[in-house]
Amino acid sequence: HHHHHHASRPCPDPTAPPNGSISPVQAIYVLKDRFSVFCKTGFELLQGSVPLKSFTAVCQKDGSWDRPMPECSIIDCGPPDDLPNGHVDYITGPEVTTYKAVIQYSCEETFYTMSSNGKYVCEADGFWTSSKGEKLPPVCEPVCGLSTHTIGGRIVGGQPAKPGDFPWQVLLLGQTTAAAGALIHDNWVLTAAHAVYEKRMAASSLNIRMGILKRLSPHYTQAWPEEIFIHEGYTHGAGFDNDIALIKLKNKVTINGSIMPVCLPRKEAASLMRTDFTGTVAGWGLTQKGLLARNLMFVDIPIADHQKCTAVYEKLYPGVRVSANMLCAGLETGGKDSCRGDAGGALVFLDNETQRWFVGGIVSWGSINCGAADQYGVYTKVINYIPWIENIISNF
C-alpha cells in the first residue's frame, strides 16, 4: 500500500526493454519507489556500450526516474584472442561472436599441438569458454623430438648430419668459445653449466644460433638469451656434478623441420638408457683430426656400465668423481666420443613407444684424449633433473 507523498508526482510506467523484464510490477510508482531490470539468459544490461551488472531506477520528487532505461543486449564475447602458431575458425557463421556462437581453434599442423579439442562457445558471462570450462584460449605447444635421423650411423668417429636430423641442436657462441645446447621448448635451451658459467652474469653476450648444419653458415636463426639459470648444486672448477643449465630466450622461436625441441625423458625412459643401449650425440666439436667440425657431426654410442666408468676415471684422474647424476657412453675399444666444443649438446635416445627423441644426457666431461679406449664420455643424467627443469620453466 503506497502513501502518496505530498507535492510529488507519480513516475511514468516503466516499459521493460526487449529481452528484459521489470520487477516489481506496480500499478503506480511514486516518490522513492524503485524498479529493477533483469535480462534473459544470454543478454546483458547495457547503458550505451557499457555493461552493468544490475540496474535499479528510483522515482524522484518531480515524477521522473533518476536514470534512463538500459537495454538488454545479446552477449557479445567479441573477437576471440589470436592463437600464436595457430588460427581460429568461426563455426556458427563468419565473425559471429554472440551468445552460443562456436569457434574452433587449431594449431599449425605437424609442428604444434594443443591438449584440448579447441572448441569454444560464447557463454552467458561474455567469455569464450571451452568444454572444460576454460576461459583462456588454448596454447599451441611445440611438437618435440621429431627427426629424420635413424640409428645406424657408424665428433670423433662420427659422420655428417643431414637436414632435420637434429633440429634441437643449438650453437652457443661466446667471444672466444663455442659450445652447444638443445632446444627443449620454443624459448628454452638446455645446456651444460660449465659451458655457460662465465656468461651467467652477461647472458646477452651469448650468441645463440639454430637451424643450421654448417657451423659457419650465414643462414641461421638467431636467438638471444634473456637469462641463464645454472643449477645451484654446480660448483665451477670443482668437478662436474650437477653440470646442467637452462637458457631462457628473449623470444619464442618458430618451430619447423629444422628447428624443433627435443623431448624431455618420461619417467619410463630410464629403461631405455641401460648399459649397451644406444644414444646419439651431435656437435661441432673436435673431430679425429683435432679440428672443430665444419659440419654438424653425429655419432651413435652405447651407454657404458656405470661401475666400469667410475673405476676408469678413479684410476685416470684420482679425485674426479663420476656421480649418480652422470651417465657414461662410449666403446671400450674407443673411437666414438664427443669432444671439446660439443659441451652442452644433447645425448638423445629414441623412445620406441612414442617414436620421439628425448634428451638423456648433456655432454659434460671426459678424458683429454677424446675417443680413447676405455675412456668414456661423461654426460649429465637429465632424468635426475626433470623436477629442476620443470620448476625453472614454470616459474620463469
Epitope: 547503458q47 550505451g48 556500450s49 557499457v50 555493461p51 552493468l52 551488472k53 544490475s54 536514470r67 534512463p68 567479441g78 558471462d125 561474455g126 567469455f127
Partner: antibody, heavy 114, light 107 residues
Framework: QMQLQESGPGLVKPSQSLSLTCTVT?????????WNWIRQFPGNKLEWMGY???????SYNPSLKSRISITRDTSKNQFFLQLNSVTTEDTATYYC???????WGQGTTLTVSS | DIVMTQSQKLMSTSVGDRVSVTCKAS??????VAWYQQKPGQSPKALIY???YRNSGVPDRFTGSGSGTDFTLTISNVQSEDLAEYFC?????????FGSGTKLEIK
C-alpha cells in the same frame, strides 16, 4: 566514501612498458560497473583507453589494441593498465574512473623521455 | 570512431548569466552522452549522464538536453566557481570518445 587512486612511475623510457595501478576503496570492483583508464594529453585532449567490467571482460580503444592490457586483482580491489612500446606521444596524465564518470582518481602524470 | 565536436573553444560569460555549451556527434548516439567539468589542476567531475540526468551532488543550475546528434549543457545563473573547461563524451559505441572541450571564462 568511494575513492580511486592511481600509482605508477612518473618517467618511462621510450620503447619500455608502462604499468599503472588503480586502487579502489569503498566499493568492490566486482560489484558493478566498468572501470576505465582515460588519459589527458598536454593541451587537455581526453582519450578513453579501455575498461575492465565488473565481470572481468575488457574493451579497448582500437587505436591502442596492440599495445594495451587491462587486468585486475579482485583480492586487492585493484585494476591495472599495461601499455607496451611507449613513445613520447604517450606523455599524458593517466586517470582511472568508474563508468558514469562519477568517480575519478586524481591522475598520475607520465613523461616518456630518454 | 564517433567524433564529438565542441565548436566553441572559449566562451565568455558573467556571473548570473545563462550559458549553453554545445556538442555535436558525428552519428546518432541516442542519449548516451555525459558532460564533465574540469577545473584547473583537478580531475574531471561528472555533471550529467545519459544526456539529461544530473549526477548526485551537482547543483540544479546545470542542465543537460538533447538526443541523437545534438547535445547541450546549460548553466543558468553562472557562478564564479563555474570557471572551468567542459567536455562532452559519448558512451554509445566503443571506443568511447570525448569532445575537445569548451573553456568558460568569467568576465
Amino acid at each position: 566514501q568511494m575513492q580511486l587512486q592511481e600509482s605508477g612511475p612518473g618517467l618511462v623510457k621510450p620503447s619500455q612498458s608502462l604499468s599503472l595501478t588503480c586502487t579502489v576503496t569503498g566499493y568492490s570492483i566486482t560489484s558493478d560497473y566498468a572501470w576505465n583508464w582515460i588519459r589527458q594529453f598536454p593541451g587537455n585532449k581526453l582519450e578513453w583507453m579501455g575498461y575492465i567490467s565488473y565481470s572481468g571482460r575488457t574493451s579497448y580503444n582500437p587505436s591502442l589494441k596492440s599495445r594495451i592490457s587491462i587486468t585486475r586483482d579482485t583480492s586487492k580491489n585493484q585494476f591495472f593498465l599495461q601499455l607496451n612500446s611507449v613513445t613520447t606521444e604517450d606523455t599524458a596524465t593517466y586517470y582511472c574512473a568508474r563508468h558514469y564518470g562519477d568517480y575519478w582518481g586524481q591522475g598520475t602524470t607520465l613523461t616518456v623521455s630518454s | 570512431d564517433i567524433v564529438m565536436t565542441q565548436s566553441q573553444k572559449l566562451m565568455s560569460t558573467s556571473v548570473g548569466d545563462r550559458v549553453s555549451v554545445t556538442c555535436k556527434a558525428s552519428q546518432n548516439v541516442g542519449t548516451n552522452v555525459a558532460w564533465y567539468q574540469q577545473k584547473p589542476g583537478q580531475s574531471p567531475k561528472a555533471l550529467i549522464y545519459s544526456a539529461s540526468y544530473r549526477n548526485s551532488g551537482v547543483p540544479d543550475r546545470f542542465t543537460g538536453s538533447g538526443s541523437g546528434t545534438d547535445f547541450t549543457l546549460t548553466i543558468s545563473n553562472v557562478q564564479s566557481e563555474d570557471l572551468a573547461e567542459y567536455f562532452c563524451q559519448q558512451f554509445n559505441t566503443n571506443p568511447l570518445t570525448f569532445g575537445s572541450g569548451t573553456k568558460l571564462e568569467i568576465k
